[in-house]
C-alpha cells in the first residue's frame, strides 16, 4: 500500500524554541516514522533537519538548528515505513516573522502597601530577540485574589512597582511582553501571587516635590510624624529600561542623608542634565519606613518650570487674576517656550475648604466670592505635553480682601 504524505504541518516558534506538529494521513498504518528536510533561500539542495529524522510521534523540535532567523526557509516532510511517501512541502516562512514572544520570568517582592515586580525575558540570551532585547515592554494584569476584579497596566519596563495596595492581602498577576517595533505581543506568564506584609509602623514619606531656588534644588515632602530622620536617593531613569539589570544602584544625595526636616537643599550641579528618579525614606532610629513612591525629576524642565507670578484685582464678588512669567533671581522674567496650563487654588482665609480652577489663559476670573472677605490664592503651572508631564511648585499664597458690595462692574 502506498504511504500518504503527512498533512497540516504547523510551525510554532516561541522565543528560540522551534516546534513542528503535523497530522498522520493514515491512522490505520502502524510503525510509521516521519522525516523533515529544510532548504534555505537561494539554495537548490535540501538538507536533513536535525532533531526531526525518523520521528515516531507527530511533533518534533528543531531548536538546535542554528538558523539565521531573518532568512526565509522551506520545509518538507514525508512518511516512512518499508517505502516512503511523496514529500509534502510546507509554505516557506521567516522564523523571526513567525516567532511569538514567550512568557516572561516574573519575580515579586512585597511591602505593606506595594509590590515590586521584576520582569525578565523567558529565554536568557535569546537568539530570536538578540537585536530587540532592549525594546521589550511589558503589560500586566493584576487582581486581588479575593475579588478577581482585574486591573491592566500597560507599557511597563523590567522593574515596576505598584503602590496603594492593601496590607496583608494576596494579589495575583500575570505579565506578557511586547515588541512594539515588530508588532508582536507575547504569551502571558503563569499567574504569580504574593501577599503584602502587615502594615509597617512607619509610613513612607509622601507628596515629594522639587523646586528651584537660586542655584539650588529644594526637595520637600510630607510626613506624618515628628522627630524623624530622612534620606533621599536618586537613580538614572533610563536604568529602569535595561532588561538585564535587576540591581538598581540608587545613590545618596549627600546633602539629603540623615536630614531631620521634611526638606533638603542641594546644589543644581549635583545632577548633570537628564531624567532621574528620586525616593525618600524615613527612620526613627528603631524602625525604617519603606521607600516613598519614586518621582521623576527632569533637570531640563525643572530648571525652567518655575511657579507663575500673578497680580490680583479685587472686586466685590470676584477676583481678576493676571498671570505673568515667573522671575529668575535678578528679577528677569523666564521665557517659557512651551504651552502651560495653570492651576489656581483659592480659599477663604478663615476656612480650609479649597476650590480649584484650571485655566489655559493668563487672565482668569475667580467668581462667586463674598464681599469684604479675605481670600487667599496660590497657583502653579503644568506643561501640557503629556510626555513632559511636569508641574511647578505652588507659588506663595497671596491674600486679598474683596471690595464692598456693588463694585462688580
Amino acid at each position: 500500500k502506498n504511504l500518504k504524505s503527512p498533512q497540516k504541518v504547523e510551525v510554532d516558534i516561541i522565543d528560540d524554541n522551534f516546534i513542528l506538529r503535523w497530522n498522520r494521513s493514515d491512522e490505520s498504518v502502524g510503525n510509521v516514522t516521519f522525516s523533515f528536510d529544510y532548504q534555505k533561500t537561494g539554495m537548490d539542495n535540501w538538507i536533513k533537519l536535525s532533531g526531526c529524522q525518523n520521528i515516531t510521534s507527530t511533533k518534533c523540535n528543531f531548536s538546535s538548528l542554528k538558523l539565521n532567523v531573518y532568512e526565509e526557509i522551506k520545509l518538507r516532510i514525508r512518511a516512512e515505513k518499508e517505502n516512503t511517501s511523496s514529500w509534502y512541502e510546507v509554505d516557506s516562512f521567516t522564523p523571526f516573522r513567525k516567532a511569538q514572544i514567550g512568557p516572561p520570568e516574573v519575580h515579586l517582592e512585597a511591602e505593606d502597601k506595594a509590590i515590586v515586580i521584576h520582569i525578565s525575558p523567558g529565554t536568557k540570551d535569546s537568539v530570536m530577540w538578540a537585536l530587540d532585547g532592549l525594546s521589550f515592554t511589558y503589560s500586566l494584569v493584576i487582581w486581588k485574589n479575593s475579588s478577581g476584579v482585574e486591573e491592566r497596566i500597560e507599557n511597563i519596563y523590567s522593574r515596576h512597582k505598584i503602590y496603594k495596595l492593601s496590607p496583608e492581602t494576596t494579589y495575583c498577576l500575570k505579565v506578557k511582553a511586547a515588541l512594539l517595533t515588530s508588532w508582536k505581543i507575547g504569551v502571558y506568564s503563569p499567574v504569580h501571587c504574593i501577599k503584602t506584609t502587615v502594615e509597617n509602623e512607619l509610613p513612607p514619606p509622601e507628596n515629594i516635590e522639587v523646586s528651584v531656588q537660586n542655584q539650588n534644588y529644594v526637595l520637600k515632602w510630607d510626613y506624618t510624624y515628628a522627630n524623624m530622620t530622612f534620606q533621599v536617593q536618586w537613580l538614572h531613569a533610563f536604568l529602569k529600561r535595561n532588561p538585564g539589570n535587576h540591581l538598581y544602584k540608587w545613590k545618596q544625595i549627600p546633602d539629603c542623608e540623615n536630614v531631620k526636616t521634611t526638606q533638603c537643599v542641594f546644589p543644581q550641579n549635583v545632577f548633570q542634565k537628564g531624567i532621574y528618579l528620586l525616593r525618600v525614606q524615613a527612620s526613627d532610629g528603631n524602625n525604617t519606613s519603606f521607600w516613598s513612591e519614586e518621582i521623576k525629576f527632569d533637570t531640563e524642565i525643572q530648571a525652567f518650570l518655575l511657579p507663575p507670578v500673578f497680580n490680583i484685582r479685587s472686586l466685590s464678588d470676584s477676583f481678576h487674576i493676571y498671570i505673568g512669567a515667573p522671575k529668575q533671581s535678578g528679577n528677569t522674567p523666564v521665557i517659557q517656550d512651551y504651552p502651560l496650563i495653570y492651576e489656581i487654588i483659592f480659599w477663604e482665609n478663615t476656612s480650609n475648604a479649597e476650590r480649584k480652577i484650571i485655566e489655559k489663559k493668563t487672565d482668569v476670573t475667580v467668581p462667586n466670592l463674598k464681599p469684604l472677605t479675605v481670600y487667599c490664592v496660590k497657583a502653579r503651572a503644568h506643561t501640557m505635553d503629556e510626555k513632559l508631564n511636569k508641574s511647578s511648585v505652588f507659588s506663595d499664597a497671596v491674600c486679598e480682601k474683596t471690595k464692598p458690595g456693588n463694585t462688580s462692574k
Epitope: H107, L108, E109, A110, E111, D112, V116, H118, I194, T197, V198, N200, E201, N245, H246, L247, Y248, K249, K251, Q252, S283, N286, N287, T288, F290
Partner: antibody, heavy 118, light 107 residues
C-alpha cells in the same frame, strides 16, 4: 562560571593593618556590589559593609566605621578590604560575597583567615 | 539596626524528617530575607532569596516562606548532606544583619 577567589591567610600583630583581596571572574564586577562578612571561630556571620566597584561608593556597619576601608580595581576585577588597628578579636575568617539586586548575596568567596597575635 | 532571632538555636533530626527553622526580625523588612547553609570550615552557600525563591541548583526540598517580620525555612525531607548550620539574613536596610544561626545535627 562565577567565582570569587580570596587572598591567602594572614598573621598580623595587634595594631597593624591587613588588606584582603577578592578577585571576581565569570561576571562584570561593575554590575554588582561586593559585600564583606566576618565570622569568628564557632560564631555566626556579621556584616561589615559593601562597595559599589563602579564608583567606589561604600556603606559600612557603624561598628567598623573608621577602621575599615573598602576599595576596588575594576581593571583587574578585584575588590579589597583593609582593616586597621587590629585587635585579637579580629582573629576571624573574612568572606566576600557578590550581591545583585533581589538575588541578594548569591555567590561567596572561600574565605580568608586573619590571625592577630603578638 | 534590625535585630534577627532564629529558633531553635539547634535541633537534632533524622534523615527523612521535615525540619522547620523560623526567623524573626525586629521590624518589617518586606520580603528582603535570604537563607544560607554553612558546613564547618566552608563558606556559606546561598539557598533562598526574597523569602521564597530558590537559587539555581538548590534542591526543591528547601523552601522559604513568610513576610514582614516572620520567616520560615523548611526542609521537607532531610538528607544526609543537609546537616549544617542555617542562617537567615535581612537586606532591607543598612546595616544588613544575620540571624545567630540554627545548627541541624543528626539525632
Amino acid at each position: 562560571q562565577v567565582q570569587l577567589v580570596q587572598s591567602g591567610a594572614e598573621v598580623k600583630k595587634p595594631g597593624a593593618s591587613v588588606k584582603l583581596s577578592c578577585k571576581a571572574s565569570g561576571f562584570n564586577i561593575k554590575d554588582y556590589y561586593i559585600h564583606w562578612v566576618k565570622q569568628a571561630p564557632g560564631q555566626g556571620l556579621e556584616w561589615i559593609g559593601r562597595i559599589d566597584p563602579e564608583d567606589a561608593e561604600t556603606k559600612y556597619a557603624p561598628k567598623f566605621q573608621g577602621r575599615v576601608t573598602m576599595t576596588a580595581d575594576t581593571s583587574i576585577s578585584t575588590a579589597y578590604m583593609e582593616l586597621s588597628r587590629l585587635r585579637s578579636d579580629d582573629t576571624v575568617v573574612y568572606y566576600c560575597g557578590r550581591y545583585h539586586g533581589y538575588w541578594a548575596l548569591d555567590y561567596w568567596g572561600q574565605g580568608t583567615l586573619v590571625t592577630v597575635s603578638s | 539596626d534590625i535585630q534577627m532571632t532564629q529558633s531553635p538555636s539547634s535541633l537534632s533530626a533524622s534523615v527523612g524528617d521535615r525540619v522547620t527553622i523560623t526567623c524573626k526580625t525586629s521590624q518589617n523588612v518586606g520580603t528582603n530575607v535570604a537563607w544560607f547553609q554553612q558546613k564547618p570550615g566552608k563558606a556559606p552557600k546561598s539557598l533562598i532569596y526574597s523569602t521564597s525563591y530558590r537559587y539555581s541548583g538548590v534542591p526543591s526540598r528547601f523552601s522559604g516562606s513568610g513576610s514582614g517580620t516572620d520567616f520560615t525555612l523548611t526542609i521537607s525531607s532531610l538528607q544526609p548532606e543537609d546537616f549544617a548550620t542555617y542562617y537567615c539574613h535581612q537586606y532591607f536596610s543598612y546595616p544588613y544583619t544575620f540571624g545567630p544561626g540554627t545548627k541541624v545535627d543528626i539525632k
